[in-house]
C-alpha cells in the first residue's frame, strides 16, 4: 500500500540566463528512500543514490548542481530548458513515487513562480 505523497514546486518560470531550484518532497510514508532520479522528458539529469551519492549526467555537468537536499539546481537557463521535469523516488518497501514540475524559461523579466501542488 503506497501511502506517500510527493509535493513539488509545481509550474514555475524563470529568466533566460538565470537559475532555478527544482524540488520535490516525499511525505506521509515511513518507506526508506534508496534513490532519487531527476529526469527531463526522457533524459536523465542526475541520480542521488543512498550508497553511491550523486551522479550528474555528463551532458549536464556544467549546468546542473545537486541540492539543496534532494533538489536540483539548473543554471545558465536557455529557452530550450522549457519543459517537464520529473523527480522519481525509489523507496523500500513502497516502490516508486514520481513528481512532475513544468518549467518555462522566459526571455523577459516577468518570470513568476507558480503555485505548489501535490501528486498522490
Amino acid at each position: 500500500m503506497m501511502t506517500g505523497t510527493i509535493e513539488t514546486t509545481g509550474n514555475i518560470s524563470a529568466e533566460k540566463g538565470g537559475s532555478i531550484i527544482l524540488q520535490c518532497h516525499l511525505s506521509s510514508t515511513t518507506a526508506q528512500v534508496t534513490q532519487v532520479n531527476w529526469e527531463q522528458q526522457d533524459q536523465l539529469l542526475a541520480i542521488c543514490n543512498a550508497d553511491l551519492g550523486w551522479h550528474i549526467s555528463p551532458s549536464f555537468k556544467d549546468r546542473v548542481a545537486p541540492g539543496p537536499g534532494l533538489g536540483l539546481t539548473l543554471q545558465s537557463l536557455t529557452v530550450n530548458d522549457t519543459g517537464e521535469y520529473f523527480c522519481i523516488y525509489h523507496t523500500y518497501p513502497d516502490g516508486t513515487y514520481t513528481g512532475r514540475i513544468f518549467l518555462e524559461v522566459l526571455e523577459s523579466s516577468v518570470a513568476e513562480h507558480g503555485a505548489r501542488f501535490q501528486i498522490p
Partner: antibody
C-alpha cells in the same frame, strides 16, 4: 569504510589566515557534498558552507562569505577551508561532514582552532 | 534564513524515563529535518533523517515525528549512554541551519 581525517589542532595569531584540511577515504569523493560546521566552546553547531567536489560548486553562510573559501583537491580526495582575518571569536572546533542522500552521515573528528597572540 | 528553535534548553531526567524533544522551524521545511546526538568531546552522530526515518545502527528507542514547522524527537526508556546534547538541522534550503540544542542530563 568511510573516513574523514582532520588534524587535531591549529594555533594561529589574530589577523592571520588558516587553511584547514579534511582528507576523505572509503567512498567516491566527487559524489558527495562536503560541508564545514564549527562549534565554539560549549556552544551549538554553526554551518559555514559546502562544496560539491564533482563540480566545485559552493554555498556559504552569509557570515562567512567574505572570509571563507572552500576548495577541493580531487587527486588527494581532500577538502580545504581557508579562513582569513581571524579573531578570537573564530576559536572553535571545525568539523567536515559529508552529505549524499541525506546529511550528515559521517563526520571528521574536528580540528580545534585556537586564535591567540 | 530558516531559524530552528529547540526546547527545552535543558532536560533533567532519570534513566528509564521517556522524553520528547521539540524543534520548531521559522517556516515550512516539509520533512527536511534531521536529528543529531553529540556527547562531550565527540563529533555529532546522526540519529534520525527526514523527520522520521530510522538510521542503521541507531537503537529503535529513538524515533522522530513531525512535518512542516513542528518536529519531535522521542526517546523511549532512556539509557545512560543517551545523555548529551541533541541538535536538529534543516536541509530544506541553503544556508543549512542547526537548532540551538537541548541538553539531556541525568537527574
Amino acid at each position: 569504510q568511510v573516513q574523514l581525517q582532520q588534524p587535531g589542532s591549529e594555533l594561529v595569531r589574530p589577523g592571520a589566515s588558516v587553511k584547514l584540511s579534511c582528507k576523505a577515504s572509503g567512498y567516491t569523493f566527487t559524489s558527495y557534498w562536503m560541508h564545514w560546521v564549527r562549534q565554539r566552546h560549549g556552544q551549538g553547531l554553526e554551518w559555514i558552507g559546502n562544496i560539491f567536489p564533482g563540480s566545485g560548486t559552493t554555498n556559504y553562510d552569509e557570515k562567512f562569505k567574505n572570509r571563507g573559501t572552500l576548495t577541493v583537491d580531487t587527486s588527494s580526495s581532500t577538502a580545504n577551508m581557508h579562513l582569513s582575518s581571524l579573531t578570537s571569536e573564530d576559536s572553535a572546533v571545525y568539523y567536515c561532514t559529508r552529505e549524499g542522500l541525506y546529511p550528515f552521515d559521517y563526520w571528521g573528528q574536528g580540528t580545534t582552532l585556537t586564535v591567540s597572540s | 534564513d530558516i531559524v530552528l528553535t529547540q526546547s527545552p534548553a535543558t532536560l533533567s531526567v532519570t534513566p528509564g524515563d521517556s522524553v520528547s524533544l521539540s524543534c520548531r522551524a521559522s517556516q515550512n521545511i516539509r520533512n527536511n529535518l534531521h536529528w543529531f546526538q553529540q556527547k562531550s568531546h565527540e563529533s555529532p552522530r546522526l540519529l534520525i533523517k527526514y523527520a522520521s526515518q530510522s538510521i542503521s545502527g541507531i537503537p529503535s528507542r529513538f524515533s522522530g515525528s513531525g512535518s512542516g514547522t513542528d518536529f519531535t524527537l522521542s526517546i523511549n526508556s532512556l539509557e545512560t549512554e543517551d545523555f548529551g546534547m541533541f541538535f536538529c538541522q534543516q536541509s530544506n534550503s541553503w544556508p543549512y541551519t542547526f537548532g540551538g540544542g537541548t541538553k539531556l542530563e541525568i537527574k
